[in-house]
Interface confidence: low
């Protein structure tokens, strides 16, 4: 049994397991009544005989079921998440790169490409990556806009990732998209350049599909005083990863207490 | 100062605040080193003089920023959430109701309408509602499908709510969408019938916009053995709310300890 | 994680989730909850050794922080980490009610 | 909630988040963390009175569960509820590093 050096703060004693169980059971008695705001168990005098009505059982079962799309409890932090994560950032390939040429003309989308060699330099192994965020500086926006993020998939196909409803704003604002899974994929594959597409949300019956929002790094022919913020504040990937040497240390000490 | 009845399990004693602070500070010393996997503070011998490089400060600032779209820490449970929630369900208005007539023809969408008087009967005041889920029973699905949920907004306009990527499946499966905010709105307004639309996700350049997924309650002319599950398992709203009498009790006891 | 998976299958002395099934009738003497008949409430128990003092060798101690005092508390304590709700069915007079009680089932514990 | 808002502006004796600003230089004697110079670490302190026993009157006790023992623990304990991360800048040799440390700042506490 464990004894602390400084008894003033020690809370650990030889504990009688049965006493703890009894206390827990009594506490649950109070907890349930308290949650129902009952001072005592309800009278059962008027309860009709026989089984519970079908509709009530159906409702009880609906409540018990975990269904697709319902958020489960947050997962406890894995051991690796306890340790510090090194933060790096990889800027988007500049827009004068030839990769952008075949994607330039669209009114409903902008494209962002990243050099995977830079990503690999920052995160040598996919398993080390704990979070990747795509950060975009959106400039002023006059009207609300619903945007969608896609990942370049193969040849000319794009895979939907997520969406965001952007409120009008008088000031620039950073947007962040969680792209951890995508960047992990890129780190596992051999490609040299990988990319995202930010598009206006197009509903099946609407025809107004123009991307109204200005993302810093794409705006050309603007006031000169914007030029300074373009370079540094163009879209980038913010990466949080376990440094390689720390990960090796972690693997070698994978033992329970 | 607090003294527990049962000393065997009491963890509370007269506590010296300064001692606790000292212990916390020393614990933080260990915590930071431990998170960085350092046995001792790193040597500062080679640190270049002068301020931190711009790029490092920019990176540090990026890390500190809470930006739009980044999930904040989960909010602590409000007091009202401690108490039990009554669970009820309101079934979708049946599809032979005239409200559906003007929406029947679309290949990319299905429509689900709800009677707000039934909702109000279950939840008399919007503030009492703590969660509302739209539950749909999807039948077999041969191909992956990306669907979107919309809320009927005004006249013929629809407001986007959320989306889901449905994996192919050989068996029926319940889907759940969190629509708490929408139902709270409906309870605050005067409308008699309110509704949702489930649509195929339409990208700006894709033309294949057919809703492939079958939702129970809409499939007609199918095998007879489905008919039995249609009525009871048609889309419904699962509501969790504080009962009115419990809420009044809560308001009257709004005092700190 | 100090969850049911690990704790129920080990003889861990330190902080862990412990098995406890509550039968409403037998343990609480209640007949008024119609569904379920009982549930796995579980509970957290076990010391979270205070593992830092100025005379302790850094290197010995550092690896233990993660388990025993990840939050660097002055007096770490074994408490629930993941909790789940419990729906119940009971009657008020002649009317059956389904209610959901939050945070009733302990799935895992942590030193905090 | 037992958060900085409530606790820093009250004289709550029971479980609450307590103010603690750590200055790396003054409190830890460290010069190696270049940014930030310190941070609001805070900590949880105060009793969570054990409020249930068979001879206690139900009605008196029930209203207190929410605050003192919402998890119906056998020995409730004052622990962090909401935590936030802390990014730091330090050097390894000549190379500056930015690292994020999870769960370093206590924003609120709870009896658990």
């Amino acid at each position: 049994d464990y004894k602390d050096d400084d008894d003033k703060l020690s809370t650990s004693k030889t504990i009688d397991m049965e006493l703890v169980k009894r206390k827990r059971i009594e506490a649950i008695r109070g907890q349930i009544l308290s949650k129902l705001r009952l001072a005592s168990p309800p009278s059962q005098g008027e309860v009709p005989p026989g089984p519970l009505p079908e509709a009530v059982l159906a409702l009880y079962n609906s409540t018990r079921d975990r269904v697709a799309g319902e958020s489960a409890e947050p997962e406890p932090e894995p051991e690796a998440d306890y340790y510090a994560k090194e933060v790096t950032r990889v800027l988007m390939v500049e827009t004068h790169n030839e990769i952008y040429d075949k994607f330039k003309q669209s009114t409903h989308s902008i494209y962002m490409f990243f050099n995977t060699s830079e990503l690999r330099e920052a995160v040598p192994e996919p398993v080390l990556l704990s979070r990747a965020e795509l950060r975009l500086l959106r400039l002023k926006l006059k009207v609300e806009q619903h945007v969608e993020l896609y990942q370049k998939y193969s040849n000319n196909s794009w895979r939907y990732l997520s969406n965001r409803l952007l409120a009008p704003s008088d000031s620039p604002e950073w947007l962040s998209f969680d792209v951890t899974g995508v960047v992990r994929q890129w780190l596992s594959r051999g490609g040299e350049i990988e990319g995202f597409r930010l598009s206006a949300h197009c509903s099946c019956d609407s025809r107004d599909n123009t991307l109204q929002v200005d993302i810093n790094g794409f705006t050309t022919g603007r006031r000169g005083d914007l030029a300074t913020i373009h370079g540094m504040n163009r879209p980038f990937l913010l990466l949080m990863a376990t440094p390689l040497e720390r990960a090796q240390h972690l693997q070698s000490s994978r033992h329970r207490r | 100062d607090y003294k527990d009845d049962d000393d065997k399990l009491s963890t509370s004693k007269t506590i010296d605040m300064e001692l606790v602070k000292r212990k916390r500070i020393e614990a933080i010393r260990g915590q930071i080193l431990s998170k960085l996997r350092l046995a001792s503070p790193p040597s500062q011998g080679e640190v270049p003089p002068g301020p931190l490089p711009e790029a490092v400060l920019a990176l540090y600032n990026s890390t500190r920023d809470r930006v739009a779209g980044e999930s904040a820490e989960p909010e602590p449970e409000p007091e009202a959430d401690y108490y039990a929630k009554e669970v009820t369900r309101v079934l979708m208005v049946e599809t032979h109701n005239e409200i559906y007539d003007k929406f029947k023809q679309s290949t990319h969408s299905i429509y689900m309408f709800f009677n707000t008087s039934e909702l109000r009967e279950a939840v008399p005041e919007p503030v009492l509602l703590s969660r509302a889920e739209l539950r749909l029973l999807r039948l077999k699905l041969k191909v992956e499908q990306h669907v979107e949920l919309y809320q009927k907004y005004s006249n013929n306009s629809w407001r986007y709510l959320s989306n889901r990527l449905l994996a192919p499946s050989d068996s029926p499966e319940w889907l759940s969408f969190d629509v708490t905010g929408v139902v709270r709105q409906w309870l605050s307004r005067g409308g008699e019938i309110e509704g949702f639309r489930l649509s195929a996700h339409c990208s700006c350049d894709s033309r294949d916009n057919t809703l492939q997924v079958d939702i129970n309650g809409f499939t007609t002319g199918r095998r007879g053995d489905l008919a039995t599950i249609h009525g009871m398992n048609r889309p419904f709203l699962l509501l969790m709310a504080t009962p009115l009498e419990r809420a009044q009790h809560l308001q009257s006891s709004r005092h700190r300890r | 994680a100090l969850d049911t998976n690990y704790c129920f299958s080990s003889t861990e002395k330190n902080c862990c989730v412990r098995q406890l099934y509550i039968d409403f009738r037998k343990d609480l003497g209640w007949k008024w909850i119609h569904e379920p008949k009982g549930y796995h409430a579980n509970f957290c128990l076990g010391p979270c050794p205070y593992i830092w003092s100025l005379d302790t060798q850094y290197s010995k101690v550092l690896a233990l922080y993660n388990q025993h005092n990840p939050g660097a508390s002055a007096a770490p304590c074994c408490v629930p980490q993941a909790l789940e709700p419990l729906p119940i069915v009971y009657y008020v007079g002649r009317k059956p009610k389904v209610e959901q009680l939050s945070n009733m089932i302990v799935r895992s514990c942590k030193c905090s | 909630a037992l958060d900085t808002n409530y606790c820093f502006s009250s004289t709550e004796k029971n479980c609450c988040v307590r103010q603690l600003y750590i200055d790396f230089r003054k409190d830890l004697g460290w010069k190696w963390i270049h940014e930030p110079k310190g941070y609001h670490a805070n900590f949880c302190l105060g009793p969570c009175p054990y409020i249930w026993s068979l001879d206690t009157q139900y009605s008196k006790v029930l209203a207190l569960y929410n605050q003192h023992n919402p998890g119906a623990s056998a020995a409730p304990c004052c622990v962090p509820q909401a935590l936030e991360p802390l990014p730091i800048v330090y050097y390894v040799g000549r190379k500056p590093k930015v690292e994020q440390l999870s769960n370093m700042i206590v924003r609120s506490c709870k009896c658990s």
């Epitope: 409120a167 950073w174 | 600032n61 500190r64 930006v67 904040a72 | - | 958060d3 600003y21 110079k37 924003r107």
Partner: antibody, heavy 122, light 108 residues
Framework: QVQLVESGGGVVQPGRSLRLSCAAS????????MNWIRQPPGKGLEWIGY???????YRANWARGRFTISRDNSKNTLYLQMNSLRAEDTAVYYC????????????????WGQGTLVTVSS | DIQMTQSPSSLSASVGDRVTITCQAS??????LAWYQQKPGQPPKLLIY???TLEWGVPSRFSGSGSGTDFTLTISSLQPEDFATYYC??????????FGQGTKVEIK
């Protein structure tokens, strides 16, 4: 169009309390940090305190005993509760939005209301 | 608390002049410093943050420099609309925020 409109000012006797409101529009209020600042007539600016999106507050040491900051995100409104008012609390009270392009600049006042005058006098 | 000291407390200058205002912090605040402009009857307006970053839409004649304890606001060529009071403000990681006492720029 971003707007912050302070209200609740006026003449109040020493020792009394007053609650100021700041109604926000034109931006997503619940995800913004907000500040209160005051300016005594003909003098400089004094920071009173700040409230984070979650409701966490920081206040200047001098404001800790008597001034409380709160917010109601559902009403897009920020509040300043002032108790035991003194003559030296006479000032124009401003609410201001925290700049958040860089997170730790929450204390940088990016957008200000026009202010409301509080006069403490018997 | 960090004390911020501005100098001068007032100055007279003509249109076209180069104007420099300094601000000194009682302890190091890295580059956690902002500058504001206030005209009579109006709320202050943010000019510069992070010691040297120009706020969106602020003319490039305004610039800021400094780090640690000593900071400077410079107006390279004073314009008629620049006559106002200027405040510096610290926002380092400690408990509080501090404004300087202000510098009034008047027409000579």
């Amino acid at each position: 169009q971003v707007q912050l409109v302070e209200s609740g000012g006026g003449v109040v006797q020493p020792g009394r309390s007053l609650r100021l409101s700041c109604a926000a529009s034109g931006f997503h209020f619940s995800s913004e940090a907000m500040n209160w600042i005051r300016q005594p007539p003909g003098k400089g600016l004094e920071w009173i305190g700040y409230i984070y999106t979650s409701g966490t507050t920081y206040r200047a040491n001098w404001a800790r005993g008597r001034f409380t900051i709160s917010r109601d995100n559902s009403k897009n409104t920020l509040y300043l509760q002032m108790n035991s008012l003194r003559a030296e609390d006479t000032a124009v009270y401003y609410c201001a939005r925290g700049w958040h392009i860089f997170g730790h600049h929450y204390w940088v006042m990016h957008f200000w209301g026009q202010g409301t005058l509080v006069t403490v006098s018997s | 608390d960090i004390q911020m000291t501005q100098s001068p407390s007032s100055l007279s200058a003509s249109v076209g002049d180069r104007v420099t205002i300094t601000c000194q912090a009682s302890q190091s605040i890295s580059t956690y410093l902002a500058w504001y402009q206030q005209k009579p009857g109006q709320p202050p307006k943010l000019l510069i943050y992070a010691a040297s970053t120009l706020e969106w839409g602020v003319p490039s004649r305004f610039s800021g420099s400094g780090s640690g304890t000593d900071f400077t606001l410079t107006i390279s060529s004073l314009q008629p609309e620049d006559f106002a009071t200027y405040y510096c403000q610290s926002y380092s990681d400690g408990d509080s925020v501090g404004f300087g006492q202000g510098t009034k720029v008047e027409i000579k």
